[in-house]
Amino acid sequence: RKAVLDCEAMKTNEFPSPCLDSKTKVVMKGQNVSMFCSHKNKSLQITYSLFRRKTHLGTQDGKGEPAIFNLSITEAHESGPYKCKAQVTSCSKYSRDFSFTIVDPVTSPVLNIMVIQTETDRHITLHCLSVNGSLPINYTFFENHVAISPAISKYDREPAEFNLTKKNPGEEEEYRCEAKNRLPNYATYSHPVTMPSTGGDSCPFCLK
């Protein structure tokens, strides 16, 4: 009789579909993730099951608290889609699909500098390229640890370019670039390149 009542409750939307979520939607291969399956009904003892496509990954019981499923995303096919099933006695509802986006992390970019020296100015062209990592990649250029460019988005495996003109400086400057894609909290930096303070022969990047 209880099962019938629970199913009747479902018909009147007192037992809606569960919600499946994760704090991280963009992941890299080998990353551990937690998936949370929760239900609006906090008074029922609910059995939660997690599926990737039709493969059953695990089952947990809960009441009032979300079920937490810990997974490791090691292969592309493990991106999803995932669904969570909430079951009370013989009655069940499934969540909407949840899929991860698997992104390859960017490798440390290489910064190249080209300079055209005039009597009064240096026309500097900075090139930055990360040869590995999922596109798009956002590049930002720094001078003495201060950002001097906006984020430059590259949707192909071509270097980002940034031009600047400087009065012949009195002191040396250090340049580097940052590469970042959709992976949160994951950025890489190039080795710094130092520009000497005076022109002439001490300008190794200058076009003569």
Partner: antibody, heavy 123, light 112 residues
Framework: EVQLVESGGGLVQPGGSLRLSCAAS?????????MCWVRQAPGKCLEWIGC?????????YYASWAKGRFTISRDNSKNTVYLQMNSLRAEDTAVYYC??????????????WGQGTLVTVSS | DIQMTQSPSSLSASVGDRVTITCQSS????????LAWYQQKPGKAPKLLIY???TLASGVPSRFSGSGSGTDFTLTISSLQPEDFATYYC????????????FGQGTKVEIK
């Protein structure tokens, strides 16, 4: 035209083995489906045997009664799915259908069927 | 096992009649609505009519409709046409420790 064509059926003695093939045309296996086998004994209802996912891992799903004697495999390069049947019994006599469904957990229904191939187990 | 029980097992009807077939599951199907209906004509493969208890499959005439949830489901043909004389099967799906895809025993719709 999208179609599934089964082959390999015929007469087999009890205890024997048979391998059925299902060739899919107009379907790109890389689009990822479950390719399934369903059988129907003469004058009886339909009975699900199992499915294989056409994606990289090729997850398998079997009816509990079919585990052990029945094996589903695939060759994605040929867009073909196979059903290996061992230790056949008279009650395995049926028309064997190849059927397709989506790969999601909620894709439980079969939306494309082959014409079927008859397997007769008799001495 | 899930047992799917259809009734009636056969019926006789005339063109234009309203026909109702029921399907009862021994336990609730998954998601409360994972039930499909198929039509099969002699010597032919089944054809999907309805899924998710009430969603019409592509290309299926609107005279077919489905309803129900949990354990009790109904297929209705609002006005029977000559091409509708066939056998109809329900299919329920459920996951326990394995997937179950259970078919009903069929309902044969014959000409009166």
């Amino acid at each position: 035209e999208v179609q599934l064509v089964e082959s390999g059926g015929g007469l087999v003695q009890p205890g024997g083995s048979l391998r059925l093939s299902c060739a899919a045309s107009g379907i790109d296996f890389s689009s990822y489906y479950d390719m399934c086998w369903v059988r129907q004994a003469p004058g009886k209802c339909l009975e699900w045997i199992g499915c294989i996912y056409t994606g990289s891992v090729g997850e398998l799903y079997y009816a509990s009664w079919a585990k052990g004697r029945f094996t589903i495999s695939r060759d994605n390069s040929k867009n073909t799915v196979y059903l290996q049947m061992n230790s056949l019994r008279a009650e395995d006599t049926a028309v064997y259908y190849c059927a397709r469904r989506g790969s999601g957990v909620d894709d439980y229904y079969f939306n494309l069927w082959g014409q079927g191939t008859l397997v007769t187990v008799s001495s | 096992d899930i047992q799917m029980t259809q009734s009636p097992s056969s019926l006789s009807a005339s063109v234009g009649d309203r026909v109702t077939i029921t399907c009862q599951s021994s336990q609730s199907v998954d998601n409360n609505n994972w039930l499909a209906w198929y039509q099969q004509k002699p010597g032919k493969a089944p054809k999907l009519l309805i899924y998710d208890a009430s969603t019409l499959a592509s290309g299926v005439p609107s005279r077919f409709s489905g309803s129900g949830s949990g354990t009790d489901f109904t297929l209705t043909i609002s006005s029977l046409q000559p091409e509708d004389f066939a056998t109809y099967y329900c299919q329920g799906t459920y996951y326990t420790t394995d997937w179950w895809n259970s078919f009903g025993q069929g309902t044969k719709v014959e000409i009166k």
